[in-house]
């Protein structure tokens, strides 16, 4: 387990000609915020594919109003880091997408308007625990300067955060075959990578990824005492001199949730349930109103009636929590029949049916699907005596073995070419057209029919603003 950290240094006009218009004006003040999406490996998946390593949204930056006649300067940035926690091993190679969003603060009906100003993407190698890596990326006429690093959360160490360190049991040396844990020379490398969060005092493992408890302790991470009143005689390295068992440290000890948030232990870490007006991993973000866009995952924000209830998020199906930040485990209702495997895709539930069954909930018993496999989460559907696969999002073909083409819908207008780039679809416009999807003609005088072109978009510019 660990955290990927992103520090934005500047966002402003890049070098060279064609400085972009300021995204804000006296009539329409605005502020910036950033979103980062991480995917493991050298992903060639489109930008629409899930951020499998995680995603994070920054706070809003200071309000900015353009000075009339002045060129766009570096724009004021939000404070702090963007942090993307990862639960498992750090993959070493990853793809990133960083989006710069503009929040217009004019008199829009229904609250602030958001628009994507720029998107940059790349693929990088990065070892956890290393120094900050600096980067510069350009999107049209904009330039984004940032640094990033991945760091392990104790007790994990190593370039992939897969080695665990524990305090030495003896003052002088580590156990047989175990090395000191650089840079923590007073700690020793653990012999096995147990399940993340497994109590080092009360848990152990004989297979990687498991967490088995010493006598007197229970719970998925061995942090819950079987009984705090009885005096047991625990075996193992944490044997108390009194022989009495005391509760081991748990992730909620000391309540990491600020501002009255309540902490609940999860199999891998902890989760804060925040009171209204607060959100964030530890309920640390406060003073929030609908103008701050606190509702995630498409939640609708409604202003509260009093200061203690500054806003209420009405969550879309599949999400819950005061900020719609928690995905509802709709599979817990066991909607898939006949032994089907339930997949919660976020936008929909999908049942992966056993051979011989089909239908949205595996309710149809079909002989013609028996023994026919649909790959990549596709389901077999009866089709007049022949089997047909209904493929999961992102896949196609007779057996769902082909990755679906983000260009299949022909999104690039006027003969523009669509390319399936790893950072998302890319349009290369035919001569005479421009815009995100080649939708605007370029007039002979060089002007375009673009009503209000996104900053940095020039004739012949590729798709960068999804």
């Amino acid at each position: 387990a660990g955290v990927f950290e992103l520090q934005i240094h500047s966002f402003g006009p890049g070098p060279g000609p064609g400085a972009p218009r300021s995204p804000c004006s006296a009539r329409l003040p605005c502020r910036l915020f950033f979103r980062v999406c991480l995917k493991p490996g050298l992903s060639e998946e489109a930008a629409e594919s899930p951020c499998a390593l995680g995603a994070a949204l920054s706070a809003r930056g200071p309000v900015y109003t353009e000075q009339p006649g002045a060129p766009a300067p570096d724009l004021p940035l939000p404070d702090g880091l963007l942090q993307v926690p990862f639960r498992d091993a750090w993959p070493g190679t990853f793809s990133f997408i960083i989006e710069t969003w503009r929040e217009e603060l004019g008199d829009q009906i229904g609250g602030p308007a958001w628009s994507l100003l720029a998107r940059v993407a790349g693929r990088r190698r990065l070892a956890a625990g290393g120094p900050w890596a600096r980067d510069i990326q350009r999107a049209g006429a904009w330039e984004l300067r940032f640094s990033y690093r991945a760091r392990c959360e104790p007790p994990a160490v190593g370039t992939a955060c897969t080695r665990l360190c524990r305090p030495r049991s003896a003052p002088s040396r580590c156990g047989p075959g175990l090395r000191p844990c650089a840079p923590l020379e007073d700690e020793c490398e653990a012999p096995l990578v147990c399940r993340a969060g497994c109590s080092p005092e009360h848990g152990f493992c004989e297979q990687p990824g498991e967490c088995r408890c010493l006598e007197g302790w229970t719970g998925p991470l061995c942090t819950v005492p079987v009984s705090t009143s009885s005096c047991l005689s625990p075996r193992g390295p944490s044997s108390a001199t009194t022989g009495c068992l005391v509760p081991g440290p748990g992730p909620c000890d000391g309540n990491p949730c600020a501002n009255g948030g309540s902490c609940s232990e999860t199999p891998r870490s902890f989760e804060c349930t925040c009171p209204r007006g607060f959100y964030g991993l530890r309920c640390e973000v406060s003073g929030v109103t609908c103008a701050d866009g606190p509702c995630f995952n498409g939640g609708l924000c409604v202003g509260g009636a009093d200061p203690d209830s500054a806003y209420i998020c009405h969550c879309p199906p599949g999400f819950q929590g005061s900020n719609c930040e928690k995905r509802v485990d709709r599979c817990s209702l066991q909607p898939c029949r006949n032994g089907g495997l339930c997949l919660d895709l976020g936008h929909a539930l999908r049942c992966r049916c056993r051979a011989g069954f089909a239908g949205p909930r595996c309710e149809h018993d079909l002989d013609d699907c028996a023994g026919r496999a649909c790959a990549n989460g596709g389901t077999c559907v009866e089709g007049g005596g022949a089997h047909r696969c209904s493929c999961a999002l992102g896949f196609g073909g007779r057996d769902c073995r082909e990755r679906a083409d983000p260009c299949a819908a022909r999104p690039c207008a006027h003969g523009g070419r669509c390319y399936a780039h790893f950072s998302g679809l890319v349009c290369a416009c035919a001569p005479g057209y421009m815009g995100a999807r080649c939708e605007f003609p370029v007039h002979p005088d060089g002007a375009s029919a673009l009503p209000a072109a996104p900053p940095g978009l020039r004739p012949g510019d590729p798709q960068r603003y999804l």
């Epitope: 060279g16 082909e402 399936a420 780039h421 890319v426 290369a428 020039r458 510019d461 590729p462």
Partner: antibody, heavy 119, light 110 residues
Framework: QVTLRESGPALVKPTQTLTLTCTFS?????????MGWVRQAPGQGLEWMGT????????DYASWAKGRVTISVDKSKNQFSLKLSSVTAADTAVYYC???????????WGQGTLVTVSS | DIQLTQSPSFLSASVGDRVTITCQST????????LSWYQQKPGQPPKLLIY???NLEIGVPSRFSGSGSGTDFTLTINSLEAEDAATYYC??????????FGGGTKVEIK
């Protein structure tokens, strides 16, 4: 493993038509790419010959290659091919196939195949 | 026809030197930044170093960097290493789905 591999004759006689094949694996033409041919004469630089766009199988050629070069795709065999007509000694080169997936760069290349034009 | 001119065509430098190669196009590349740089060693296909003028390809050492837009571009090797001896090519993509390569710059280690 995503790979490209060129194949074809090592020796061609002048005036004949050279046919080369690029076999790809690890990806499918159901996605949209430019599949291109680039050649390099001994001791010389790289020269783009042409590309075929898998979205609609339209082709684009270098100005010198128009009328001499034909690029086509056989989707069922996971191959695309190059035909170069009326070859001369000046067409002696290493021929590479390459893939473009956006932003104008060839991110994947074959190892290349040397073709000598000689009688 | 579009021409990409690289200069110099040959350079000799010592390990640790900062090396700069320029690439000038007779037309603006598509989107102002659809220009890439490749390294080629004898008997091998070109290897992508930089795409979109300044994006470092995965696995390429950070001593390589690219800059520029429109018609003028630069590849910089910050601290030359012995393994960097190779020929370097720029390549542009242009409106009308046209590709072009520069003539190449051979880098030799003194």
């Amino acid at each position: 493993q995503v790979t490209l591999r060129e194949s074809g004759p090592a020796l061609v006689k002048p005036t004949q038509t050279l046919t080369l094949t690029c076999t790809f694996s690890g990806f499918s033409l159901s996605s949209s790419y430019d599949m291109g041919w680039v050649r390099q004469a001994p001791g010389q630089g790289l020269e783009w010959m042409g590309t075929i766009y898998t979205g609609d199988y339209s082709t684009d050629y270098a100005s010198w290659a128009k009328g001499r070069v034909t690029i086509s795709v056989d989707k069922s065999k996971n191959q695309f091919s190059l035909k170069l007509s009326s070859v001369t000694a000046a067409d002696t080169a290493v021929y590479y196939c390459a893939r473009h997936t956006g932003y104008g760069y060839f991110g994947l290349w074959g190892q290349g195949t040397l073709v000598t034009v000689s009688s | 026809d579009i021409q990409l001119t690289q200069s110099p065509s040959f350079l000799s430098a010592s390990v640790g030197d900062r090396v700069t190669i320029t690439c000038q196009s007779t037309e603006s590349v598509y989107g102002s930044d659809w220009l890439s740089w490749y390294q080629q060693k004898p008997g091998q296909p070109p290897k992508l170093l930089i795409y979109q003028a300044s994006n470092l390809e995965i696995g390429v050492p950070s001593r390589f960097s690219g800059s520029g837009s429109g018609t003028d571009f630069t590849l910089t090797i910050n601290s030359l290493e012995a393994e960097d001896a190779a020929t370097y090519y720029c390549q542009g993509y242009y409106s009308g789905y046209i590709y072009a390569f520069g003539g190449g710059t051979k880098v030799e280690i003194k």
